[in-house]
């Protein structure tokens, strides 16, 4: 097979015919050294999945349910290109499965038992698989056959295409459960009509169904959405209140050696030449031979799936949970309202050691999961492999954009016993230099810089945001002669100053000696001209407070702060000489786990928090000898957020605006994936 050939998998005679036409027409418009199409015919989409995994084919387009099959071992395929619908300006690659109710009803998601339900059809995504998958563990046992369990859960339903003889309750609201538009309650509009007519109490549909059926906002305002956290939201707020986000139609390929760049090159060229309204002789998104061949007829084009986005992230935690429940039919032994152990995400092996120690001291209430970077940890929390971690504000922003929520804030200044209920204002992000140097904020160009890590607040977002507004470009590695900013490209000048050791050089975790606040300060001490850190860093590492060899003889007066007005001040004056105020680090979790995480952590800090005086012979949660492992070492307590329970409210408008501006310079693959 030539290197540049994409073997497309077709699942019927008609698809094979269209594939051959696709191949021939692409040959006519692409250069001979460009990508080419070859066609492989298989009996089913599952056979195509297996063929791609076995390297007998390269690509196929699948519905969400099959993307799940493709991702499961041993297939291990991943999404590489998404079809989009709607306009190029506002491309839709996902739809949201929602539960719609009338505003004047008064029940929540956890009170659906005994209500009347309206479904689009048996076995359909938004109307059946997702809601029933998510409700699966609340269904009465035995849960097989599923239709019987559902019939016993709701007091009456309309489930088009169900067997009305065996399960009459599923057809109570639409006698016969007709499987076509002859049934007035069939499909999306039908399920909504079932609710509208008052036959049912809840309709499981797509987010767009309400808008398609009610043009008038006043009419739409008579309805609400049920959210998974047992609240309700307006029908406009479907992005924050849905059962699952469902990808529409996706091209998948092998995770390793999958030719994803080639597939994208091919499809990008294909949409240019044969996309909507492009060509008379061949159309990518329609066919005389049948409906939805190779691609959906309703598609308007393709978008490249960001490389960081694996199938778990693409399908989303809720969707995977629903499908896994339905497929595997397993439920936790504990009732769902009971808190299971919280899986903490530890960064590299230093944090893992502390987490293991915490785990055994917590009597197993805390479990540990590891990842090599903060972004990998956030991804693990998103997909349910982990539950929580404490993050710098820059990563609270990324986590928030990825759907996680802040749960508790680290407090650094408030003494107990008021600490737990106090909302602190934050800490100061500062620029530290040696007293002996002549540096000011205005002559940093060409100097050596030390950063906690790319994407972190004091070490990156604040100083680089200020710098960006001065230089109007993102080439920070050209502004400084060299530096250490863990998380930068390995060949960048901003990795040149890092200490490693070797395979971990410039990695954004504790294996890199110049990582974090203490690491960035060490970088200044040993090699750099300026360090971007928190205002407490110099006092915490001088005057013998850090006994490590590099720090034990350091004096506070040998360092000064750079002020934005071009002056310098003592490290004792951060309130009058700082770059900006930074939001405190915060614990984040998935919405569904937030309450459990909060309850458990408040309990854990009562046992292992700052009230423990002897950390040499007891486990201390907020202590790791200047390494800031799991939490900042200067944490006094974890504090409740009260109403600051979204990332925007927690970080504050000013900081969110600053980070959003800096996104032009973003090197975050996770942020790119989460905003896809």
């Amino acid at each position: 097979v030539p290197e540049k050939s994409v073997r497309w998998c077709a699942v019927s005679e008609h698809e094979a015919t269209k594939c051959q036409s696709f191949r021939d027409h692409m040959k006519s418009v692409l250069p001979s050294n460009g990508p080419s199409v070859a066609c492989v015919k298989k009996a089913s989409h599952l056979d195509c999945i297996r063929a791609i995994a076995a390297n007998e084919a390269d690509a196929v387009t699948l519905d969400a349910g099959l993307v799940y099959d493709a991702y499961l071992a041993p297939n291990n395929l991943k999404p590489v290109v998404a079809e989009f619908y709607g306009s190029k300006e506002d491309p839709q690659t996902f739809y949201y499965a929602v539960a719609v109710v009338k505003k004047d009803s008064d029940f929540q998601m956890n009170q659906l038992r005994g209500r009347k339900s309206c479904h689009t059809g048996l076995g359909r995504s938004a109307g059946w698989n997702i809601p029933i998958g998510l409700l699966y563990c609340d269904l009465p046992e035995p849960r097989k056959p599923l239709e019987k369990a559902v019939a016993n859960f709701f007091s009456g339903s309309c489930v088009p295409c169900a067997d009305g003889t065996d399960f009459p309750q599923l057809c109570q609201l639409c006698p016969g459960c007709g499987c076509s538009t002859l049934n007035q309650y069939f499909s999306y509009s039908g399920a909504f009509k079932c609710l509208k007519d008052g036959a049912g109490d809840v309709a499981f549909v797509k987010h767009s169904t309400i808008f398609e059926n009610l043009a008038n906002k006043a009419d739409r305002d008579q309805y609400e959405l049920l959210c998974l956290d047992n609240t309700r939201k307006s029908v406009d707020e479907y992005k924050d209140c849905h059962l699952a986000r469902v990808p529409s139609h996706t091209v998948v390929a092998r995770s390793v050696g999958g030719k994803e760049d080639l597939i994208w090159e091919l499809l990008n060229q294909a949409q240019e030449h044969f996309g909507k309204d492009k060509s008379k002789e061949f159309q990518l998104f329609s066919s005389p031979h049948g409906k939805d061949l190779l691609f959906k007829d309703s598609a308007h084009g393709f978008l490249k799936v960001p490389p960081r986005m694996d199938a778990k992230m693409y399908l989303g935690y809720e969707y995977i949970t629903a499908i896994r429940n339905l497929r595997e039919g397993t439920c936790p032994e504990a009732p769902t309202d009971e808190c299971k152990p919280v899986k903490w995400c530890a960064l590299s092996h230093h944090e893992r050691l502390k987490c293991d120690e915490w785990s055994v001291n917590s009597a197993g209430k805390i479990e540990c999961e590891s990842a090599e970077t903060t972004e990998d940890c956030i991804a693990k929390i998103m997909n349910g492999e982990a539950d929580a971690m404490s993050l710098d504000g820059g990563f609270v922003y990324i986590a928030g954009m990825c759907g996680l929520v802040p749960v508790l804030a680290e407090n650094y200044n408030t003494p107990n016993p008021n600490c737990e209920n106090t909302a602190e204002e934050g800490y100061f992000a500062v620029a530290v230099v040696k007293s002996s140097s002549d540096l000011t904020w205005d002559n940093l160009k060409g100097k050596k810089s030390c950063h906690t890590a790319v994407g972190r607040t004091a070490g990156w977002n604040i100083p680089m945001g200020l710098l960006y507004s001065k230089i109007n470009h993102c080439r920070f590695d050209e502004f400084f002669s060299e530096g250490c900013a863990p998380g930068s490209e390995k060949n960048s000048s901003l990795c040149k100053l890092c200490m490693g050791p070797s395979p971990n050089l410039c990695e954004p975790n504790n294996k890199e000696g110049y990582y974090g606040y203490t690491g960035a300060f060490r970088c200044l001490v040993e090699k750099g001209d300026v360090a971007f850190v928190k205002h407490q860093t110099v006092p915490q590492n001088t005057g013998g407070k850090n006994p490590d060899a590099w720090a034990k003889n350091l004096k506070e007066e040998d360092y000064e702060l750079l002020c934005l007005d071009g002056s310098r001040k003592s490290v004792q004056e951060p309130a009058n000489c700082h770059l900006a105020r930074a939001p405190n680090h915060a614990v984040v979790a998935r919405k569904d786990k937030a309450d459990c995480v909060q309850t458990l952590l408040l309990d854990q800090q009562r046992m292992f928090g700052s009230s423990v005086t002897d950390c040499s012979s007891n486990f201390c949660l907020f202590e790791s000898k200047t390494k800031d492992l799991l939490f900042r070492d200067d944490t006094v307590c974890l504090a409740k957020l009260h109403d600051r329970n979204t990332y925007e409210k927690y970080l504050g408008e000013e900081y969110v605006k600053a980070v959003t501006n800096l996104r032009k310079c973003s090197t975050s693959p996770l942020l790119e994936a989460c905003t896809f």
Epitope: H350, L353, V360, N361, A363, S617, F619, K625, L629
Partner: nanobody, 117 residues
């Protein structure tokens, strides 16, 4: 700071048993948490088992029901009883008292356990 020395490793057949010891140079009474870790070839060091002064224990899923951790404060020694050994238990085993030197990667020599027929 107490020094820890591991011993008791060796070559054993699948299904066999070994008992590892971790002897401390000073009192372990004041040490809250101790643990056993292992490093398999080409892999990260991973937790095998841990124990607190109060007797809480924790085990990796892969060894639950086969390994047992204990400590004898009077003898300043911690133990790992390993039963029903499998080839995948082959590794260098290290003990730790979770003191700050472990944040500096300052581990002892460890003791080699090889499970092979």
């Amino acid at each position: 700071q107490v020094q820890l020395v591991e011993s008791g490793g060796g070559l054993v057949q699948p299904g066999g048993s070994l008992r590892l010891s971790c002897a401390a140079s000073g009192s372990i009474f004041s040490i809250n948490t101790m643990g056993w870790y292992r490093q398999r070839p080409g892999k990260q060091r991973e937790l095998v088992a841990a124990i607190t002064r109060g007797g809480n224990t924790n085990y990796a899923d892969s060894v639950k029901g086969r390994f047992s951790i204990s400590r004898d404060n009077a003898k300043n020694t911690m133990y790992l009883q390993m039963n029903s050994l499998k080839p995948e238990d082959t590794a260098v085993y290290y003990c730790t008292d979770y003191s700050r030197r472990y944040y500096q990667d300052d581990w002892g020599q460890g003791t080699q356990v090889t499970v092979s027929s």
